[in-house]
Amino acid sequence: AGHLEQPQISSTKTLSKTARLECVVSGITISATSVYWYRERPGEVIQFLVSISYDGTVRKESGIPSGKFEVDRIPETSTSTLTIHNVEKQDIATYYCALWEV
């Protein structure tokens, strides 16, 4: 079975900078899985943001600002990355990755 690890416990960024979060997949080939990213803002319910499927298709939640989030995967390191552009107050949250095994 697949296992996920988010090596960064926290990431502190200056306003307007870029944050890059990592999710390391083990126990399964990342190319055979879909990785989902979620956000949990303080005091709010968890929200789906973006996913990248086994075939590389990216799906974004409607209502998420265009250009704010970028998702990628690096098969060589078995890692999915979530890039948050122009970090601002609304981006303060806990970010989770999740796995869907095909």
């Epitope: 926290s10 502190t12 306003l15 307007s16 803002r41 303080p42 005091g43 709010e44 319910v45 600002p65 250009g67 704010k68 122009n86 601002e88 107050k89 609304q90 303060i92 806990t94």
Partner: antibody
Framework: EVQLVESGGGLVKPGGSLRLSCAAS????????INWVRQAPGKGLEWVSS????????YYADSVKGRFTISRDNAKNSLYLQMNSLRAEDTAVYYC??????????????????WGQGTMVTVSS | EIVMTQSPGTLSLSPGERATLSCRAS???????LAWYQQKPGQAPRLLIY???SRATGIPDRFSGSGSGTDFTLTISRLEPEDFAVYYC??????????FGQGTKVEIK
């Protein structure tokens, strides 16, 4: 001195348009979320719209959605509210107001800590 | 939409008395996202309390906020002449609108 100054109010006919401006000074404008709040004569406060520091997140009250557009120019330290298809019920004093900003490492607070003096918008035939 | 209901509508008190203003939300609001404002005639509102209980810069300690979930309170321990005004609560929820209460007027008895 930390300051917000609104301008652009006036008398307009129903169905008309108006563009409000809000000039900021005394603080790093590009680091703050900004809101528009209005107050009809003799009534309470009504939140209208907000825009985050980098303009990615924009929100509107249902009463103005599709008619009003909020924008900002961080290089000019300015906030704008384009108001189209104006109605009599849009008659109010319009305030721009600054959000508190980040107040913690893994959380944030909300509150409007700096307000302009307001600009009056009257919609009447 | 979260509806904020303030009570009472008007509070008639004398200087030196204690004022207790209530704000009730139609659904739970995070304490971090609850603010109180004071507004005097012809003036813009002034932030008093943010995060339900933190005083804004320059606000005297006779003003205090408390509460959580759906019930929040603004207390003025000893009313000064300059405290007679209209007070509003406002919530910032997980999605707009960021509604204000209808206001409580504190007037001189």
């Amino acid at each position: 001195e930390v300051q917000l100054v609104e301008s652009g109010g006036g008398l307009v006919k129903p169905g008309g348009s108006l563009r409000l401006s809000c000039a900021a000074s005394g603080f790093t404008f590009s680091s703050y979320d900004i809101n528009w709040v209005r107050q009809a004569p003799g009534k309470g406060l009504e939140w209208v719209s907000s825009i985050t520091s980098s303009s990615y997140y924009i929100y509107y009250a249902d009463s103005v959605k599709g008619r009003f557009t909020i924008s900002r120019d961080n290089a000019k330290n300015s906030l704008y509210l384009q108001m189209n298809s104006l109605r009599a019920e849009d008659t109010a004093v319009y305030y721009c107001a600054r959000d508190l900003g980040v107040r913690g490492v893994d959380y944030y607070y909300y509150g409007l800590d700096v307000w302009g003096q307001g600009t009056m918008v009257t919609v009447s035939s | 939409e979260i509806v904020m209901t303030q009570s009472p509508g008007t509070l008639s008190l004398s200087p030196g008395e204690r004022a207790t203003l209530s704000c009730r939300a139609s659904q739970s609001v995070s304490s971090s996202y609850l603010a109180w404002y004071q507004q005097k005639p012809g003036q813009a509102p002034r932030l008093l309390i943010y995060g339900a209980s933190s005083r804004a810069t320059g606000i005297p300690d006779r003003f205090s906020g408390s509460g959580s979930g759906t019930d929040f309170t603004l207390t003025i321990s000893r009313l000064e002449p300059e405290d007679f005004a209209v007070y509003y609560c406002q919530q910032y929820g997980s999605s707009p609108p960021y509604t204000f209460g209808q206001g409580t007027k504190v007037e001189i008895k």
